[in-house]
Interface confidence: medium
């Protein structure tokens, strides 16, 4: 069976301040079992933006019903964008375990923030 891929189709997304940004992410397989997390930045200093399993992310909503067992779309919408939200966002698949371990990352989507139109 072909190994799971994490696909972030948009290399970059530009959003006006105050609007919502949609960051697309799909996976190509249901295996291995485990959650998706979104991060801003890469490496040890990356920042957790959304965790499918737990956490408090009031500005982040999932575009599809990500809790459904057969779901393969893990796109998110971030509301009320500000300049501080600019950066590269990575959709990361984890393998279920104790603790969950990182399995594969998407290529990243760069979010740029435009000034609010006057």
């Amino acid at each position: 069976e072909e190994e799971l891929q994490v696909i972030q189709p948009d290399k970059s997304v530009s959003v006006a301040a105050g609007e919502s940004a949609i960051l697309h992410c799909t996976v190509t397989s249901l295996i291995p079992v485990g959650p998706i997390q979104w991060f801003r930045g890469a490496g040890p200093a990356r920042e957790l933006i959304y965790n499918q399993k737990e956490g408090h992310f009031p500005r982040v909503t999932t575009v599809s019903e990500s809790t459904k067992r057969e779901n393969m779309d893990f796109s998110i919408s971030i509301s009320n964008i500000t300049p501080a939200d600019a950066g590269t966002y990575y959709c990361v698949k984890f393998r279920k375990g104790s603790p969950d371990t990182e399995f594969k990352s998407g290529a990243g989507t760069e979010l740029s923030v435009r000034a609010k139109p006057s």
Epitope: A45, I49, A84
Partner: antibody, heavy 119, light 108 residues
Framework: DVQLVESGGGVVRPGESLRLSCAAS????????MNWVRQAPGEGLEWVSR????????DYADSVKGRFTISRDNSKNTLYLQMNSLRAEDTAVYYC????????????WGLGAPVTVSS | ETVLTQSPATLSVSPGERATLSCRAS??????LAWHQQKPGQAPRLLIY???NRATGIPDRFSGSGSGTDFTLTISSLQTEDSAVYYC??????????FGGGTKVEIK
Amino acid sequence: DVQLVESGGGVVRPGESLRLSCAASGFSFRSYAMNWVRQAPGEGLEWVSRIDSGGGGTDYADSVKGRFTISRDNSKNTLYLQMNSLRAEDTAVYYCAKQYDWNSFFDYWGLGAPVTVSS
Amino acid sequence: ETVLTQSPATLSVSPGERATLSCRASQTVGSKLAWHQQKPGQAPRLLIYDASNRATGIPDRFSGSGSGTDFTLTISSLQTEDSAVYYCQQYYYWPPYRFGGGTKVEIK
């Protein structure tokens, strides 16, 4: 009820080190970004440092960069601030503050830990 | 960096009267502005977030307004327990998170 209790403050000489702790309870500590904010005697509030919920992302005010290190132990629900090479101008009450969201306001504050740097 | 300027530095108001505090940002911060209250010898407490939303448990005599660069905190009928320093905080650009210099509200 959300509770943030700082400890570890005290009186030190310039150049010495101190580690502050902030014990958190009443909320899912591991889900929230946390901050340190300080207030010098008779002065306003100055943001010092921030750490994201997982502990990977950190930010510092220019005035403490390279001297202070923020960290957290999510298994102990505790936030830390390691302060090295302390200076007289670091004298302040240090507050830990919970962040509502990863890019948002501070919704709860601790009671504060006084730090005095004096020769 | 965004600078927040609060005015006046001190405000002296009689009980029952209205107190109006101003916070001006050097560049737009959208609606990403909070107000914190700090009573003498106490830690700060969140009053208002996103410019106009009252935090949990905050009496409705406190209200916030404004967007962009000009913001106002209004205490509609001042109570003696409202004697405190009030700070605005922006979270539109960071780091660093910035606070205003504070407005001290005194009871006449």
